[in-house]
C-alpha cells in the first residue's frame, strides 16, 4: 500500500527557517500535494502550500518557498517569525493526491529535542488516510 | 456557482467600528482563504488580510496597525471584516475574495463604506 | 513590503492594436503573478495567473509573460470592451497590487 512519509528539520544556519520534506511512496502520479499545519488540511489545519506538477506552486505565509525535489517529493521552507507560530511544536501535513489510487496523507513534527540540521526520521505517523 | 455575496453600503461616523460581511456559496466554504481588499476611488488596491475558515488563522497589512479583525462563521460559510477606529481615509469600497491556487479567483460585489459627520 | 510598480497609468489604444502592459516587482517574486480586469462599478476579474496561465474562460488574445521581477500583460486585436483598468498582483509574499493602467480609445 501507497505510504507517505514526513521529515520536519531546522536549518543550521538559521534557527529561525524551518523545511518540511514530503514524499510519496507508491506506485502512480501525483496530480496534487497540499501541505498544512496544526493538524490535517480540513480537520482544524491551516493550509500552507499547494503544489500542482504542471501548473506550479501556490503558498501562504509563513511559508516562503514550496518546491519539488523529485516527481513524488516535495519541500517546503517556512520563515518562522516568532511567537505567532511556534513550528518547534507546530504539526505539519503533507496530503498527496495519486491517480489512481487517491488520496494519502500523514503528519510529522520536529522531534522535541532536535539538534539544528537533524529532521524526522522518514516514516509515517498514524494518521495515515487514504480518501 | 461560485458566489460571494456582500453587505449592503455602510454610512457610518468617525470613531466607531463597521462590519461587513461577505457569504460564500457554491464551494467549500473550510478549504480557500478569504482576502479582504480595499479600493478607494480612483485608486489602486490595498489587501487588508485573509483568514483561514478551516482554522480561523489570520494575517493583516501591518499598516492597519490592529484596527481590521476577520473573522468567520464556518456554520453559515460567512466571513465579516471589522474595521475600527474609522476616519475619512476609511472611507472606500471594501471587496472580499476567494484566495486559491489561482490567485484571488471569485470576488464579491463589494461593499462601501463612507465615513462621515 | 514588495511594490510592484506598473509605470504607465494610462494608455491609449484602437480597437485591433497589440497592448503590452508592463508590471515590475521591487524583488523577485518567481512567477507567482496575476493580472486582473476592472471595469467601472465591477469587481476584479482574473485573467492570468503564475505569470503566463489564461484563467478559465479568458480569450486568448490575452497573454501573460515574464518571470523574477518583470512581467507583462499583451492583449492582442484589441476590443472595445477591453478597455478597462489593468492591474498586477504578486502572491509571492503576502499580497501586493500594482497602481494599475487604464486602457482608453486615442
Known amino acids: 500500500t501507497p505510504e507517505v512519509w514526513v521529515q520536519v528539520q531546522m536549518e543550521a544556519t538559521e534557527l529561525s527557517s524551518f523545511t518540511v520534506h514530503c514524499g510519496f511512496l507508491g506506485p502512480g502520479s501525483i496530480s496534487l500535494v497540499t501541505v498544512s499545519w496544526g493538524g490535517p488540511d480540513g480537520a482544524g489545519g491551516t493550509k500552507l502550500a499547494v503544489l500542482h506538477p504542471e501548473l506550479g506552486t501556490r503558498q501562504w505565509a509563513p511559508a516562503r518557498q514550496a518546491r519539488w525535489e523529485t516527481q513524488s517529493s516535495i519541500s517546503l521552507a517556512l520563515e518562522d517569525s516568532g511567537a505567532s507560530s511556534p513550528f518547534a511544536n507546530t504539526t505539519f501535513c503533507c496530503k498527496f493526491a495519486s491517480f489512481p489510487e487517491g488520496s494519502w496523507e500523514s503528519c510529522g513534527s520536529l522531534p522535541p529535542s532536535s539538534d539544528p540540521g537533524l529532521s524526522a526520521p522518514p516514516t509515517p505517523v498514524p494518521i495515515l488516510r487514504a480518501d | 456557482q461560485i458566489q460571494l455575496q456582500q453587505s449592503g453600503p455602510e454610512l457610518v461616523k468617525p470613531g466607531p467600528s463597521v462590519k461587513i460581511s461577505c457569504k460564500a456559496s457554491?464551494?467549500?466554504?473550510?478549504?480557500?482563504?478569504i482576502n479582504w481588499v480595499k479600493q478607494r476611488p480612483g485608486q489602486g488596491l490595498e489587501w487588508i488580510g485573509w483568514?483561514?475558515?478551516?482554522?480561523?488563522?489570520?494575517k493583516y497589512n501591518e499598516k492597519l496597525k490592529g484596527r481590521a479583525t476577520l473573522t468567520v462563521d464556518t456554520s453559515s460559510s460567512t466571513a465579516y471584516m471589522q474595521l475600527s477606529s474609522l476616519t475619512s481615509e476609511d472611507s472606500a469600497v471594501y471587496f472580499c475574495?476567494?484566495?486559491?491556487?489561482?490567485?484571488?479567483?471569485?470576488w464579491g460585489q463589494g461593499t462601501s463604506v463612507t465615513v462621515s459627520s | 513590503d514588495i511594490v510592484m510598480t506598473q509605470s504607465q497609468k494610462f494608455m491609449s489604444t484602437t480597437v485591433g492594436d497589440r497592448v503590452s502592459i508592463t508590471c515590475k516587482a521591487s524583488?523577485?517574486?518567481?512567477?507567482?503573478v496575476a493580472w486582473y480586469q476592472q471595469k467601472p462599478g465591477q469587481s476584479p476579474k482574473l485573467l492570468i495567473y503564475?505569470?503566463?496561465n489564461r484563467y478559465t474562460g479568458v480569450p486568448d488574445r490575452f497573454t501573460g509573460s515574464g518571470s523574477g521581477t518583470d512581467f507583462t500583460l499583451t492583449i492582442t486585436n484589441m476590443q472595445s470592451e477591453d478597455l478597462a483598468d489593468y492591474f498586477c498582483?504578486?502572491?509571492?509574499?503576502?499580497?501586493?497590487f500594482g497602481a494599475g493602467t487604464k486602457l482608453e480609445l486615442k
Open positions: 524583488q523577485n517574486v518567481g512567477t507567482a
Open positions: 498582483l504578486q502572491y509571492s509574499s503576502y499580497l501586493t
Open positions: 503564475s505569470a503566463s
Open positions: 483568514i483561514y475558515p478551516g482554522s480561523g488563522y489570520t
Open positions: 475574495a476567494r484566495d486559491s491556487f489561482y490567485a484571488m479567483d471569485y
Open positions: 457554491g464551494y467549500t466554504f473550510t478549504d480557500y482563504y
